[in-house]
Interface confidence: low
């Protein structure tokens, strides 16, 4: 006999969220001894029943699920992890990163972190939701629609994996959902932009038009800008993003959103992988999270920051990147873009720490929920005291004091931000302020090597 549950809609809670959360926590703790089941943070692996929908190597794709029976919210998270776009670099990926191409060694459980956590302290936004983590094993930015065959050494079925996961989840409670949030980081973030409308369409066709489908794209809003130093398209990392995607689409039999595809000529579908081009064509509301100085963007632009002195040209290039990115988010009403040098955020445990203009990401997402209320369209007038368009305006990396620690891309060592920015040629006043130093002090310290 199933226990009757009373779903609470936390988006309606206004006023003092901290006080409310404290009450909920206290209630939960007082009820906990009555509960027979242990609170389990883990998401459990389910390989797809339809074994024809596979990872690159033909092993079945799958998803990790943690149900929350009292909730009508479903969070489907698409994992990231670059891509491969020809036989050679896919072979190399299979040798070095097999987990991203095969389900054979996936663990039976995963712990939900960040936005996938069921702890209100770690996830004040959607801790009560049904959590789904979809591992990335198609290497195609979630766009592929081709199976393994004699001709094709690898399957690329990213777009089909999402469709199949949704189909299977309908039998596990998704059919009763009020909101489905398709989220993802890095390649998964781009995957959100490529698939969110298709998921909405799929649910409509299957007879679930009342489920509101929304997107949350983290660190997947890339620019097809000019590289700092042009290199030939040899491997995944040095290949210019436009060229890598152009080649990839053909190799993966990649599919892009229909409305975007219609805007470009045949052979030009690669344009739809770039957020600022695909976003205006999307019907579903999408919240964009993007570091202004994204490490993956810098990597494909052949910028490698090691703390070594930087030429004036590179400093200007980096500042210009932040400016360009800020410009592309100008007309994105729901966005969160801190001026930090980093990559990915939403499934980090400390995703609540970063703020833009005094607002954290979970708070901004809560405001976004409120602004959408029961309609599919974003309200044009922002709610008072509840901002959803949060883009840093200060112009250099790490000028936001809540940025995560800067780490050397190669050694992983924490870098002294003041020195790092000095090497990049930023003016002393600019560098000193967020470090809590006077320019003269900073100059003295750096020049005497202390």
């Amino acid at each position: 006999q199933p226990v009757e549950s009373f779903p609470l809609d936390f988006t309606a809670v206004e006023g003092n969220m901290d006080s409310f959360m404290a009450q909920v926590k206290s209630l939960a703790q007082s009820l906990y001894p009555c509960s027979a089941q242990q609170l389990n943070e883990d998401l459990r692996l389910h390989l797809l029943l339809n074994t024809s929908v596979t990872c690159n190597d033909g092993s079945p794709a799958g998803y990790y699920l943690k149900e929350s029976r009292g909730s009508r919210r479903w969070l489907l998270f698409l994992e990231g992890g670059w891509y491969c776009f020809n036989r050679e670099n896919c072979d190399s990926r299979y040798d070095t990163m097999r987990r991203l191409m095969s389900s054979r060694d996936w663990p039976r459980t995963r712990t939900g972190t960040g936005i996938l956590s069921s702890q209100p302290e770690e996830n004040p936004y959607w801790w009560n939701a049904n959590m789904v983590f979809i591992p990335y094993c198609s290497s195609d930015v979630w766009s592929g629609a081709s199976s393994k065959s004699e001709k094709n050494e690898y399957a690329f079925m990213g777009a089909l994996i999402i469709q199949e996961v949704v189909r299977e989840l309908l039998g596990r409670g998704l059919s009763g959902a009020k909101v489905l949030l398709l989220a993802g980081s890095s390649a998964g973030g781009t995957g959100v932009l490529l698939n969110v409308d298709r998921v909405a369409e799929q649910l409509e066709k299957l007879g679930y038009p009342a489920i509101q489908v929304r997107g949350l794209a983290d660190s997947g809003w890339f620019l097809d800008n000019k590289q700092y130093r042009h290199t030939d398209c040899v491997d995944t990392i040095t290949c210019a993003p436009t060229e890598a995607i152009r080649r990839g689409i053909r190799y993966w039999n990649g599919v892009v959103p229909e409305r975007c595809r219609r805007q470009f000529q045949e052979g030009e579908e690669w344009n739809c992988f770039f957020g600022y081009k695909v976003y205006p064509t999307l019907r579903c509301p999408v919240f964009v999270v993007q570091w202004l100085f994204d490490e993956a963007q810098l990597t494909v632009d052949n910028v490698h920051l090691t703390g070594q002195p930087v030429q004036e040209g590179l400093r200007l290039y980096i500042q210009n990147l932040g400016r360009e990115l800020r410009h592309t988010l100008k007309d994105v009403p729901a966005s969160f873009a801190p001026a930090c040098l980093s990559h990915e955020i939403i499934i980090r445990s400390h995703w609540t720490d970063v703020q833009v203009k005094g607002t954290s990401l979970p708070r901004a997402l809560h405001c976004w929920d409120r602004s959408l209320h029961d309609s599919h369209k974003a309200s044009k007038t922002p709610l008072k005291g509840c901002p959803v368009h949060l883009v840093d305006s200060c112009p250099w990396p790490h000028c936001n004091p809540s940025c995560p620690t800067v780490r050397d891309q190669f050694t992983g060592q924490e870098m002294n931000v003041a020195q790092f920015l000095m090497h990049m040629g930023f003016d002393m006043q600019t560098v000193a302020q967020p470090q809590g130093l006077e320019p003269s002090e900073l100059l003295g310290m750096l020049s005497n090597g202390s």
Epitope: Q419, Q433, E441, M445
Partner: antibody
Framework: EVQLVESGGDLVKPGGSLKLSCAAS????????MHWLRQAPEKGLEWVAY????????SYANTMKGRFTISRDNAKKTLSLQMTSLRSEDTAIYYC????????????WGTGTTVTVSS | DIVLTQSPASLVVSLGQRATISCRAS??????????MHWYQQKPGQPPKLLIY???NLESGVPARFSGSGSGTDFTLNIHPVEEGDATTYYC?????????FGSGTKLEIK
């Protein structure tokens, strides 16, 4: 549990020297800038010195420059403050504190060690 | 150095009422939309404890009765409703530039 424990406080004569230590545990010490602060009896809080995570940046309060030296050993997770030419006005409880790198505030404090400078 | 003037020096508030403490900086401690002002509570014989950071952010584990506001040079710490255990000393601190400085403290008494 995140913890800072100071030691080395003592009674010392004016002009004398003393070395304070601070042992860190429960967090990645090498990730954080560290400060020494002090509080004279029945007085307010006063900042003493700062050292960045990799010891690349050192800074001192004006009245302590040249007399105090801050240092750290990341492998041993210890912070030190070498004090020389001590004066009676240096009498205080000395605290080590962790600098949160998201804005320069002190999010973890030690319990303090007492330094008394008197003849 | 930036001087922080805290007021009042002492404050008597009834149990359950609101306590308001002010901190004024001699120069702006805000930059690029962020205010580098923080608040601490210090009980006798104990080290200070962080309550509020970057003007308005509640430190983890601190009750929601504490709140901070302000920008530029004027900042406020509010405690509402005041409880018995809140009777102690409160300090503001800035980290806009080195040296970080503290206010002279406000002693809160509960009646």
């Amino acid at each position: 549990e995140v913890q800072l424990v100071e030691s080395g406080g003592d009674l010392v004569k004016p002009g004398g020297s003393l070395k304070l230590s601070c042992a860190a545990s429960g967090f990645t010490f090498s990730d954080y800038g560290m400060h020494w602060l002090r509080q004279a009896p029945e007085k307010g809080l006063e900042w003493v010195a700062y050292i960045s995570s990799g010891s690349t940046t050192l800074s001192y309060a004006n009245t302590m420059k040249g007399r105090f030296t801050i240092s750290r050993d990341n492998a041993k997770k210890t912070l030190s403050l070498q004090m020389t030419s001590l004066r009676s006005e240096d009498t205080a409880i000395y605290y080590c504190a962790r600098k949160n790198y998201n804005g320069g505030y002190f999010d973890v404090w030690g319990t303090g060690t007492t330094v008394t400078v008197s003849s | 150095d930036i001087v922080l003037t805290q007021s009042p020096a002492s404050l008597v508030v009834s149990l359950g009422q609101r306590a308001t403490i002010s901190c004024r900086a001699s120069k702006s401690v805000s930059e690029s939309g962020y205010s580098y002002m923080h608040w601490y509570q210090q009980k006798p014989g104990q080290p200070p404890k962080l309550l509020i950071y970057l003007a308005s952010n509640l430190e983890s584990g601190v009750p929601a009765r504490f709140s901070g506001s302000g920008s530029g040079t004027d900042f406020t710490l509010n405690i509402h409703p005041v409880e018995e255990g809140d009777a102690t000393t409160y300090y503001c601190q800035h980290s806009r530039v080195l040296p970080p400085t503290f206010g002279s403290g406000t002693k809160l008494e509960i009646k």
